[in-house]
């Protein structure tokens, strides 16, 4: 089943993507593009990292996590309806045809009309790991917090062992995680 990532107009959207570096600081180039992952590289690139740093980014797109530890999740600031669509996270692993590519579907909803004038908290701060899974019955919203007790390698291992289960889909799609090395 498809997993959708949701945000409201004016909020920040979060699209998760992870890899586990083979060794600390041993980074892999990553690109984010608007639109489905092409066969090679990323189309319509919005952000790119190299072996050391973020070397290209465009307005409103940034990495909020620690990309030096493999958290290359994309934050899109102050989203509009036009930001809806597929985004590509491509982890450009060295070697022959080793790239891992993940298509992530972002759905932007119109902002809710709130009668009370309470100030809305920043979406990413309030819900740093939010995803909506589509399964039986109504959509369920899950928050994974900041995953304090599970490291990326464990997520990757769990997802590999349980790839066909719903848990695996939730883990993988909430952290499109691969292990390198």
């Amino acid at each position: 089943s498809e997993v959708e990532y949701r945000a409201e107009v004016g909020q920040n959207a979060y699209l998760p993507c992870f890899y586990t570096p083979a060794a600390p600081g041993n980074l892999v180039p990553v690109c984010w593009g608007k639109g489905a992952c092409p066969v090679f590289e990323c189309g319509n690139v919005v952000l790119r990292t190299d072996e050391r740093d973020v070397n290209y980014w465009t307005s409103r797109y940034w990495l909020n996590g620690d990309f030096r530890k493999g958290d290359v999740s994309l934050t899109i600031e102050n989203v509009t309806l036009a930001d809806s669509g597929i985004y590509c996270c491509r982890i450009q692993i060295p070697g022959i045809m080793n790239d891992e590519k993940f298509n992530l579907k972002l759905v932007i909803k119109p902002a809710k009309v709130t009668p009370a004038p309470t100030r809305q908290r920043d979406f990413t701060a309030a819900f740093p790991r939010m995803l909506t899974t589509r399964g039986h019955g109504p959509a369920e919203t899950q928050t994974l917090g900041s995953l304090p007790d599970i490291n990326l390698t464990q997520i990757s291992t769990l997802a590999n062992e349980l790839r066909d289960s719903r848990l695996a889909n939730d883990l993988r799609d909430s952290g499109a995680t691969i292990r390198i090395g």
């Epitope: 639109g35 992952c37 092409p38 066969v39 590289e41 189309g43 298509n103």
Partner: antibody, heavy 119, light 112 residues
């Protein structure tokens, strides 16, 4: 307007190296991927390989040991070298553009050049 | 490598009549986001191939809307609602999800 034009010898001897050049216009090799596809006489299409806009190369595993794709961005040209050719490499060779998005995979092709491998 | 199999290998159609070509892949061409990496190309006699359909069901630039593509997973179909004389040629499906990219054997469309 986008154009790709193949050039190179039409006849290559067995065991020698086939060398073709594709000259492009209307786009930059640093913004688009380019590659090669071949078609033996009366047969279907076979993907050979590609050089991405970033300069990475990907090759068909069946040909990888024999194939090299390079580019010269200053001349708007890229090339194909296929070593140790046999009669099975006789084909029309097309250069192609990969538009870097899913909508534009092989969106432009050269007209093709026939290469015969024979002694 | 992913093997692409087309049927039929040839068909003859009266102008104005519909035509359908099937393509099957040895592995799924759809990913977890529902993106299906299946392409259709047409090679007219004496010409280079041209892109008809991308991602299984999307029309390429300048392609007439009498062409349509459908399918997901491993089974795909190209349909021409009303065949015209200019549609003659060889139709190829191609998978674009894994390297090496691979094509079907081709289906030759002729006009009766």
């Amino acid at each position: 307007q986008v154009q790709l034009q193949e050039s190179g010898p039409g006849l290559v001897k067995p065991s020698e190296t086939l060398s073709l050049t594709c000259t492009v216009s209307g786009f930059s090799l640093t913004n688009y991927g380019v590659g090669w596809i071949r078609q033996p006489p009366g047969k279907g299409l076979e993907w050979i390989g590609i050089m991405t806009s970033g300069g990475s190369t990907y090759y068909n595993s069946a040909l990888r040991a024999r194939v090299t794709i390079n580019r010269d961005t200053s001349k708007n040209q890229f090339s194909l070298k296929l070593s140790s050719v046999t009669a099975a490499d006789t084909a029309v060779y097309y250069c192609t553009r990969d538009g870097t998005t899913v909508e534009t995979l092989f969106d432009y092709w050269g007209q093709g050049t026939m290469v015969t491998v024979s002694s | 490598d992913i093997v692409m199999t087309q049927t039929p290998l040839s068909l003859s159609v009266t102008p104005g009549q519909p035509a359908s070509i099937s393509c099957r892949s040895s592995q799924s061409l759809s990913d977890s986001a529902g993106i299906t990496y299946l392409y259709w190309y047409l090679q007219k006699p004496g010409q280079s191939p041209q892109l008809l359909i991308y991602l299984a069901s999307n029309l390429g630039s300048g392609v007439p809307d009498r062409f349509s593509g459908s399918g997901s997973g491993t089974d795909f179909t190209l349909k021409i609602s009303r065949v015209e004389a200019e549609d003659v040629g060889v139709y190829y499906c191609m998978q674009g999800i894994h390297v090496p990219l691979t094509f079907g054997q081709g289906t030759k469309l002729e006009i009766k």
